[in-house]
Interface confidence: low
């Protein structure tokens, strides 16, 4: 397993609708044709997998249908969007990139993006 550098922004603020987007960029040492991107959430020293997708270079990024993540790829950049976030989801979101194919296998883990989520106050005229 060979190491690879992965860059991602330090801080992102989720929108009032609970959507956060950030770019995960990796320094590809070779011509990868199959790439796997995993988003991990670290909070209170616990690490959990948020979502993952395998994609072929030049093809769209396909998460599972029930995933809270969507994304697009362009070259060595992956534009990730996480939806449905609430205040309790605030935490460090780490981008993990694996160059699966062809060998050699490369693994890169970013330093993480701190996503802050603030639950919106209900509007006075709403039905809440």
């Amino acid at each position: 397993c060979k190491a690879m550098h992965v860059a991602q922004p330090a801080v992102v603020l989720a929108s009032s609708r609970g959507i956060a987007s950030f770019v995960c960029e990796y320094a590809s040492p070779g011509k990868a044709t199959e790439v796997r991107v995993t988003v991990l959430r670290q909070a209170d020293s616990q690490v959990t997998e948020v979502c993952a997708a395998t994609y072929m270079m030049g093809n769209e990024l396909t998460f599972l249908d029930d995933s809270i993540c969507t994304g697009t790829s362009s070259g060595n950049q992956v534009n990730l969007t996480i939806q449905g976030l609430r205040a309790m989801d605030t935490g460090l979101y780490i981008c993990k990139v694996e160059l699966m194919y062809p060998p050699p296998y490369y693994l890169g883990i970013g330093n993480g993006t701190q996503i802050y989520v603030i639950d919106p106050e209900p509007c006075p005229d709403s039905d809440f």
């Epitope: 044709t33 199959e34 993952a52 997708a53 395998t54 072929m56 396909t62 599972l64 699966m100 194919y101 062809p102 060998p103 296998y105």
Partner: antibody, heavy 123, light 107 residues
Framework: QITLKESGPTLVKPTQTLTLTCTFS??????????VGWIRQSPGRALEWLAL???????RYSPSLKSRLTITKDTSKNLVVLAMANMDPVDTATYFC???????????????WGQGTLVTVSS | DIQMTQSPSSVSASVRDRVTVTCRAS??????LAWYQQKPGKAPKLLIY???SLQSGVPSRFSGSGSGTDFTLTISSLQPEDFATYYC?????????FGPGTKVDIK
């Protein structure tokens, strides 16, 4: 010991949908890196790769046939199903399912094959 | 799609002959090439993967070489059970593509 076996109709009519099942043993499609592919061979002709499904539910299709193909898996029953819509006489072929070789991490060679099933498309 | 060509399309040989089959890719596929053997009415059998790696259980008289666009399958001493059709397959880029095959028959 890895084994695969294809099953399905031997004769389909033009415009119908062909559904083939690959039943396998000796491996699990929930194991990271595992995949099952479908390849066909028209009488007296070369091999043509059709589709592949990964352990993680991701699918890949031959671009020329993508609009007609659907590949699914049932991990608990150890089977993979290929559906091919709008069959035509030119689709007459022997259809094979095969296990993706994972000796090299993430590879795309097929190291175990089923015996194949001959499908004839005719009215 | 990457086009795969093989030569010769057929070869007549005798037992204990050295047989060489070549495969050419229309673009660079690194070493992501496999060789399969197929006998009539049977499924293909993987012989060589990653251009030169011998699949488990395959006799050592089979060997593969090459990188980039040009590849070779060699049978060092042909045995009666080797009379079959041989196909190459590229696995560098989707869609995977196979060569048209080389038939090895008895002289």
């Amino acid at each position: 010991q890895i084994t695969l076996k294809e099953s399905g109709p031997t004769l389909v009519k033009p415009t119908q949908t062909l559904t083939l099942t690959c039943t396998f043993s000796g491996f699990s499609l929930s194991t990271s890196g595992v995949g099952v592919g479908w390849i066909r061979q028209s009488p007296g002709r070369a091999l043509e790769w059709l589709a592949l499904i990964y352990w993680n539910d991701h699918e890949r299709y031959s671009p020329s046939l993508k609009s007609r193909l659907t590949i699914t898996k049932d991990t608990s029953k150890n089977l993979v199903v290929l559906a091919m819509a709008n069959m035509d006489p030119v689709d007459t072929a022997t259809y094979f399912c095969a296990h993706r070789n994972i000796e090299y991490r993430r590879s795309y060679f097929f190291d175990y094959w089923g015996q194949g099933t001959l499908v004839t498309v005719s009215s | 799609d990457i086009q795969m060509t093989q030569s010769p399309s057929s070869v007549s040989a005798s037992v204990r002959d050295r047989v060489t089959v070549t495969c050419r890719a229309s673009q660079d596929i690194n070493n992501w090439l496999a060789w399969y053997q197929q006998k009539p009415g049977k499924a293909p059998k993987l012989l060589i993967y990653a251009a030169s790696s011998l699949q488990s259980g395959v006799p050592s008289r089979f060997s593969g070489s090459g990188s980039g666009t040009d590849f070779t399958l060699t049978i060092s001493s042909l045995q009666p059970e080797d009379f079959a059709t041989y196909y190459c397959q590229q696995a560098n880029t989707f869609p995977f593509t196979f060569g048209p095959g080389t038939k090895v028959d008895i002289k």
